[in-house]
Each structure stands twice: as structure tokens, then as C-alpha cells.
């Protein structure tokens, strides 16, 4: 039997946010139902995790031996602290799209561990704020965006923006 440390060395985690409780659930991406030591985990989920606080989970299973895999859960900031904002200027709305993630509230997570991603059609941007220029007037554009904390996606949003009519004579 492999050690649990080896077996779950590359375990990945998804963070799910509860807007009512303002707490996260960490979903462990494993095929079998594991045990989590002192932390209670139900169906491979660790519940009631506070934003920006680390939690340590000891993962074991009867298919592997000691030592257990110690997984540090780096809990992201609360999702409601981010808003995807349309920053397009009215006078340029016929050929321009501007989108920006706004941090409407501070948090204690390290901001340097946060990355932003936008995908508009086949264009990808790793920025917090994007401005697309020289677009076709009266066209519909779809932009998908996500925010990652330590490379774990914890929130996403999509915007469908229709550029305005062009000025007469253009």
C-alpha cells in the first residue's frame, strides 16, 4: 500500500461559498470517500471554513498507510467582497468595453495570491481590469471572468455587453 501522503500528494480542492453564512466549503477532489482526522468531513467536503484563515486537514483512507496527507486549506476571501463592474464610458460605448473587478471591502488574505482572468471570445487577459477597443458597433460580446486564490478558482462572473449604435455617418 502507498502512504496516504504519497497517494494524495497532488490532491486538488474546490472552494464553494455560502452567501448566507459567509463561510466556505472545501470540496476534496478524490475518487473515494476519505477521512479527515480531527476535521469533520462529509462526502469529501470540509465545511464552515472562515475566509482568509488557514485550516489543516489530515487525509487518510484504508487504501493507504501512515503518514496521512496533511493538506493546508488556504481559504479565499469572501465572494461578496468582489464585484464585476462595467466601467465603459458612455461616450465610447459604441466601440469599447471596459470591465473591472472592484474590491468593495478589505480582507486579510494576501492580495498578491489573487489572480484575475478574463476571456472575451478567444482573447484571454490576466488582469483585474480590461478595456477592449476598436470593437464593432451594435455587436454582442460575452466576457467570462474568474478570480483565483493560490490558483484555486473561488468566484466567477459573466457579462454580455452589446456595444452601442455607431454615430451617424461613421
Amino acid at each position: 500500500k502507498p502512504t496516504c501522503d504519497e497517494k494524495y500528494a497532488n490532491i486538488t480542492v474546490d472552494y464553494l461559498y455560502n452567501k448566507e453564512t459567509k463561510l466556505f466549503t472545501a470540496k476534496l477532489n478524490v475518487n473515494e470517500t476519505v477521512e479527515c482526522g480531527n476535521n469533520t468531513c462529509t462526502n469529501n467536503e470540509v465545511h464552515n471554513l472562515t475566509e482568509c484563515k488557514n485550516a489543516s486537514v489530515s487525509i487518510s483512507h484504508n487504501s493507504c498507510t501512515a503518514p496521512d496527507k496533511t493538506l493546508i486549506l488556504d481559504v479565499p476571501p469572501g465572494v461578496e467582497k468582489f464585484q464585476l463592474h462595467d466601467c465603459t464610458q458612455v461616450e465610447k460605448a459604441d466601440t469599447t468595453i471596459c470591465l473591472k473587478w472592484k474590491n468593495i471591502e478589505t480582507f486579510t488574505c494576501d492580495t498578491q495570491n489573487i489572480t484575475y482572468r478574463f476571456q472575451c471570445g478567444n482573447m484571454i487577459f490576466d488582469n483585474k481590469e480590461i478595456k477592449l477597443e476598436n470593437l464593432e458597433p451594435e455587436h454582442e460580446y460575452k466576457c467570462d471572468s474568474e478570480i483565483l486564490y493560490n490558483n484555486h478558482k473561488f468566484t466567477n462572473a459573466s457579462k454580455i455587453i452589446k456595444t452601442d449604435f455607431g454615430s451617424p455617418g461613421e
Epitope: 471591502e105 478589505t106 492580495t111 488582469n127
Partner: antibody
Framework: EVQLVESGGDLVKPGGSLKLSCAAS????????MSWVRQTPEKRLEWVAY????????YYPDTVKGRFTISRDNAKNTLYLQMSSLKSEDTAMYYC????????????WGAGTTVTVSS | DVLMTQTPLSLPVSLGDQASISCRSS???????????LEWYLQKPGQSPKLLIY???NRFSGVPDRFSGSGSGTDFTLKISRVEAEDLGVYYC??????????FGGGTKLEIK
């Protein structure tokens, strides 16, 4: 190490122009809004310019509006302040400072660069 | 513009004493989102300013707990419970509520009596 290093300060004549630079390192520059703040010889601190993370939004106080232009090159991790029609009251130590968003705080400051406007 | 007025201009203290600095804004700096973006910075001799307190009373990481901020509306206070030699310098309050018209207070110099 997170660092901001200003350069470009000099002695200039009234009416002259000057461009300041601020080189950022140790952090994802393109995720941070940035500002220029100056300190007068009397030690007063004055905010002079603000730019959003992607360079989309810029803000200035009335004292420098139309004379100063803040810009950034995220590929070069550099912030700029183009100053024109300089006046003696623009004499100051100029600091660049980062602010994660408008509702945050200035958590990292550079050491400053000195601008002297005098004939 | 929002005017930030600090008192006193100079504050002579003995090491170990409590120090209190006042900052008054010319209008309310409570933002429509309910937050008050009042910050305190310390500039030690020969250095650039450093953040101490944000949003009235939140200590920035690494700031000793002898520093505390309080207040609401237009009146704010920074207290240092037991002044140490490393606390000497000029303290500035700052309002970030009226974006984008940021303003600093005039500064208070904390010095040894």
C-alpha cells in the same frame, strides 16, 4: 521583496516639464491601483494623481489637473507622472504608493524622488 | 474638498506616556456603503510614510497593539498607550471616503518632552 523605486526628480525652471518614473517589483503590479503623493518642504502630504490597475481610470486634484498626467506600463511594471507647466509650489518630494483598490489603503510607498521648481 | 484638521501640531511626550492625536474632517467621511475610510500614517525621520490604521480602527499587519484608532462621522482619534522611542515622527490622518478627492491632515509631530 515588494518594492517601489522612484526616479526622474530634478531641478527645473517654472513652466518646465519633467517625467517621473516608479519601478515596481515583488508583486503583481497589474492588479494594483497606484498613486503619486507629494510632500512639500513644509512637510504637508498631498495626493496628486491616481490610476486604476489597468490604466482605465485616472483622477487628479484641481491643483494639478490639466498639468499632470499619470500613466502606467503594466508590461514594464512601471508607473509614470508627466508634469508640465511646473510652478514653484510643485516643489516637493514625490512618492509613488500602491493601493489595492480605491477602498483600501496605501500599504507600500517608495523612498521618493525630489522635484525642485526654481528659476 | 474635504479638509482634514489635525491637533495638536506638536505633541511632546515622555516615553511610556499615553499620546492622543485628534483629526477632524470638514464634512462627514462616512461613505454611502456604510464604511468610513479614515487612515493613519506614521512618517519617521528620513523615511517614507507607513500605514498604521485603516478604516478608523483596524490595525495594519505588524502594527503593535499599543496603537488604536477610534471615532466616527467627522471626529477621529489615534491613541498610543505607551509611547516608545520608535514611535517618534509625524502622524498623518487621511480620508479616502470621498473618492477620488483624497486628502491628508496637516500632520502631528510626536517628540520627546
Amino acid at each position: 521583496e515588494v518594492q517601489l523605486v522612484e526616479s526622474g526628480g530634478d531641478l527645473v525652471k517654472p513652466g518646465g516639464s519633467l517625467k517621473l518614473s516608479c519601478a515596481a517589483s515583488g508583486f503583481a503590479f497589474s492588479n494594483y491601483d497606484m498613486s503619486w503623493v507629494r510632500q512639500t518642504p513644509e512637510k504637508r502630504l498631498e495626493w496628486v494623481a491616481y490610476i486604476s490597475s489597468g490604466g482605465v481610470s485616472t483622477y487628479y486634484p484641481d491643483t494639478v489637473k490639466g498639468r499632470f498626467t499619470i500613466s502606467r506600463d503594466n508590461a514594464k511594471n512601471t508607473l509614470y507622472l508627466q508634469m508640465s507647466s511646473l510652478k514653484s509650489e510643485d516643489t516637493a518630494m514625490y512618492y509613488c504608493a500602491r493601493r489595492y483598490d480605491v477602498w483600501w489603503y496605501f500599504d507600500v510607498w517608495g523612498a521618493g524622488t525630489t522635484v525642485t521648481v526654481s528659476s | 474638498d474635504v479638509l482634514m484638521t489635525q491637533t495638536p501640531l506638536s505633541l511632546p511626550v515622555s516615553l511610556g506616556d499615553q499620546a492622543s492625536i485628534s483629526c477632524r474632517s470638514s464634512q462627514s467621511i462616512v461613505h454611502s456603503n456604510g464604511n468610513t475610510y479614515l487612515e493613519w500614517y506614521l512618517q519617521k525621520p528620513g523615511q517614507s510614510p507607513k500605514l498604521l490604521i485603516y478604516k478608523v480602527s483596524n490595525r495594519f499587519s505588524g502594527v503593535p497593539d499599543r496603537f488604536s484608532g477610534s471615532g466616527s462621522g467627522t471626529d477621529f482619534t489615534l491613541k498610543i498607550s505607551r509611547v516608545e522611542a520608535e514611535d517618534l515622527g509625524v502622524y498623518y490622518c487621511f480620508q479616502g471616503s470621498h473618492v477620488p478627492m483624497y486628502t491628508f491632515g496637516g500632520g502631528t509631530k510626536l517628540e520627546i518632552k
